[in-house]
Structure formats: C-alpha cells, structure tokens
C-alpha cells in the first residue's frame, strides 16, 4: 500500500488561555500521489511540550465518505480508550476513557480532530485515528512523546570542580562543557518518567578561569558559565 511521506509540519500558536497549542498534521506537499484505498498504518513520532495544548488530526477524508470515525488511545498502564462517532446515527460512544482533558475538538460531524488540553506526562502514548469507509480503513497514528523542560543549575562544589545539573527533564538532557574537563556524568531516573542528569567536572589546568556548561534538550538549549574560584562560588540556576 502506498504511504505518505512522514515529513511533517508543526504549527504553534497562542490560545486565549495563554497555553501554547501545537497541531500536527500532514504536510500537504508530502502526500504520496497514488494513495491506495486501504492504507497501511501511517505512524508519526511527535514530541510535544508538557503543559501545552495538542491537536491530533485524521486523514483528509470528507464526512460524506465515512461510516465511522474512531480515535484509539493507548496510554501506559491503562486500558485502551476508544472514542467513536457513527455517522448514520450521529452518535458518539466512549469506552474506557477517563481522562477529561482528551476530547474531540468539536462535534465529530464538524471536526474529527482530537485535542489534549494541558498535556501532562501521563499523556505519553499512542493515538490513532481510524476512518472507516465503505471500501476500507484509513489510519493515522501518533506516538506522542511528552517533553519536560529540565531545570538547569551550575555551581562549584570543590576547588576547580563544577557541577552542572539538568533536573527532571524528559527525555534526558545532554550536558557538555567548554573547555572540556575531567568529567563524570550520572543519570537519576524518576518514577514519573523524568531524568536528572548530573555532570561533575574538574579542571587541573590553572589557566582555565571560566567554564561553560551547555545543556542540550529537545525543548531547547541552555548555557551557563561560572568562574572557577579557589572556594565554592555562588549557585546559578535557570530554566531552559
């Protein structure tokens, strides 16, 4: 079965309630021309920031062609939730759906999109739109990865030794130093899926007076610098 290219566009806007909102839909320029009548699974990995709003889209098929629209939601440690709309009877049905933040954007007969209001870590999972037509099913799947921005701190704890921490990020942040030193990195995993990364570096060379900790993360990058003092210096802290 022909499948669309998974090149995507991520649109970000501001909602009235000041939450960033992102909508992931197919980039129209990337759709394969010869679309088969029955589509194999089309899946997309989608990173989305925690506390934003997310909108997930179905394939572009007009309601007049459809029999049933179903959203299947599989979240870690929970039974599969399904939200279905049957066109013939104009009725919606939900099975095992407990999260009130996951809803249809509007009436399914007007808009088949699914929205997640104020994305939380618990929304990590797989979301699939299934459009049932008389001649087969069209699928659009999303592996939703919730991103959590780590809190970054940098401080000196011993003579010519600095500690850079990226606390409670998801996924784990990557820490690098300028200039490079003699470093040890540890990761601490939390039950909610976040990770704290701690990098401790020592510089023996005495002409190194200022060091920079660079934290790379999917939500953005952050650099902090500190002067190496003979005694521990002031603590620096920042959000990405």
């Amino acid at each position: 079965a022909a499948q669309p290219n998974n090149s995507l566009m991520l649109q970000t806007s501001k909602e009235n309630h000041a939450l960033a909102s992102s909508s992931l839909c197919m980039d129209e320029k990337q759709i394969t021309q010869n679309y088969s009548k029955v589509l194999a699974e089309v899946n997309t990995s989608w990173p989305v920031k925690m506390a934003t709003n997310a909108v997930l889209c179905c394939p572009p098929i007009a309601l007049r062609n459809l029999i049933i629209i179903t959203w299947e939601i599989i979240l870690r440690g929970q039974p599969s939730c399904t939200k279905a709309y049957k066109k013939e009877t104009n009725e919606t049905k939900e099975t095992n759906c407990t999260d009130e933040r996951i809803t249809w954007v509007s009436r399914p007969d007007q808009n088949s999109d699914l929205q997640i209001r104020t994305v939380a870590i618990t929304h990590d999972g797989y979301y699939r739109c299934i459009m049932v037509t008389p001649d087969g099913n069209f699928h659009r799947g999303y592996h939703l990865q919730v991103l959590v921005t780590p809190e970054v701190t940098l401080f000196q704890n011993r003579n010519r030794t600095a500690v850079c921490k990226a606390v409670a990020g998801k996924p784990a942040a990557h820490i690098s130093w300028i200039p490079e030193g003699d470093c040890a990195t540890k990761q601490e995993y939390w039950s909610n899926g976040t990770v704290t990364v701690k990098s401790t570096c020592h510089w023996e060379v005495h002409n190194v007076s200022t060091v920079t900790c660079h934290v790379s993360h999917l939500t953005g990058n952050k650099s902090l610098y500190i002067e190496l003092l003979p005694v521990p210096g002031a603590k620096k802290s920042a959000k990405l």
Epitope: C25, E28, P60, A62, P134, D135
Partner: antibody, heavy 119, light 110 residues
C-alpha cells in the same frame, strides 16, 4: 479501469423533465460518492449535488433543491439525475464524477451528455 | 455556501511563459492542516481533468510544471513554463462542505 458513462441527453421541451444515467464500471459502485455537475455552453462548471450509493445519502446545491433528484440502482451500478420543470437556461452538458476518498478530489469524470431545452 | 472568486477570467500568454491563476474563497477551506482546494483543466468538448488536489499535491501523471500553493482562503495555480497543450480553461474547486467551482480562467495563445 474506472469508467463513467453518461446517457439520456437530448432535446427536451420547456417545462419537461430529464433523466440522465451514469453507468459506473471498474470499481465497487457502492463504495464511492458520485457527484453531478453541469456546464452551460461557454460557461463554467456548476455543482448540482451528490449521492452516496452506499447509504443513499444525498446533498444538493441550494439552487437545484426541489427540482433535481439523485438516485442510484446498485444492481445496475448506475447513478441517476432527474430534473423537472426544465427551462432554456438548463441547456448544458451534464457530467457525473466520482469522488476519491483521500482529499475528496474528483479523479474520474464521465464524458458528459448534452441536454438541450428548446421548443 | 463558500463562494470562489477566480482571477483573471482570461489571459493571453506565449509558450514558455510562467502563468499564475489565483482563487479566493469567501471563507477558509482549510481544516486539520489540509486545504480542500483542487485545480482542474478543461479543454473544449472534454471533461475536466484533475491537476492539483489538497492545494499543492500533483495528481499522478500530471507534468511537474504545474504546481499549487496557498491555504485558508487564498490559493494559486502556477504553470512554470507554458506548453502548447496547456492552452485550456482552468477551474479551482473546494470540497470541504458543499462544493463550489471558481468561474474559470481561460488561457489563450497570445
């Protein structure tokens, strides 16, 4: 190969009616929405309405409501357009076109049939 | 109903010219990241032929000199280098709700 063939065109008297046929082949007839469009001589395309043979769901351009009726015969794989109270301005080539699912685009059209309303 | 305004209604061009036709909808024809706007070519005595669907996707078998762009209410069909067989009438069409065609643009030989 998908094919749509219209028939039933010809000369009709003002006030009369027409019944056009669109015979479909090369696909499962009940699976796709069929649209009807007309084009007056030297004019643009005008959407009349559609029928979904799967469930006989129909929808019409407001202009043709009450005067046009769409139907289908699943056993014959044929869609029909019936139009009543014909006027000279209904003189046109009438087309049927199949809507594809993805993008709701019209990938297949019939060749058209000419209806002339004249006394 | 959504009204479609196509411009120009006609244009004269030469082989090799770049031709641009625009279509404006009275309200947005985009939803869920897709624009339900299509472009068709029609030659005298023939049925229309699909060129572009969902605003910017080239239908299979259509030459790459044809391209479409736009979203929301404003759309464009571009022929990068006009060929002799491209002299025809072009229509935009939306299929989001009830369907409407633009009034057509006739591309004639200069």
């Amino acid at each position: 190969e998908v094919q749509l063939v219209e028939s039933g065109g010809g000369v009709v008297q003002p006030g009369g009616s027409l019944r056009l046929s669109c015979a479909a082949s090369g696909y499962t007839f009940t699976s796709y929405v069929m649209h009807w469009v007309r084009q007056a001589p030297g004019k643009g395309l005008e959407w009349i309405g559609y029928i979904n043979p799967y469930n006989d769901d129909t929808n019409y351009n407001e202009k043709f409501k009450g005067r046009a009726t769409l139907s289908s015969d699943k056993s014959k794989n044929t869609a029909y357009l019936q139009m009543n109270s014909l006027r000279a301005e209904d003189t046109a080539v009438y087309y049927c076109a199949r809507e594809d699912y993805y993008g709701s685009r019209w990938g297949y059209w019939g060749q058209g049939t000419l209806v002339t309303v004249s006394s | 109903d959504i009204q479609m305004t196509q411009s120009p209604s006609s244009l004269s061009a030469s082989v090799g010219d770049r031709v641009t036709i625009t279509c404006r909808a009275s309200k947005s024809v985009s939803t869920s990241g897709y624009s339900y706007m299509h472009w068709y070519q029609q030659k005298p005595g023939k049925a229309p032929k699909l060129l572009i669907y969902l605003a910017s996707n080239l239908e299979s078998g259509v030459p790459s000199r044809f391209s479409g762009s736009g979203s929301g209410t404003d759309f464009t069909l571009t022929i990068s280098s006009l060929q002799p067989e491209d002299f025809a009438t072009y229509y935009c069409q939306h299929s989001r709700e009830l369907l409407t065609f633009g009034q057509g643009t006739k591309v004639e030989i200069k």
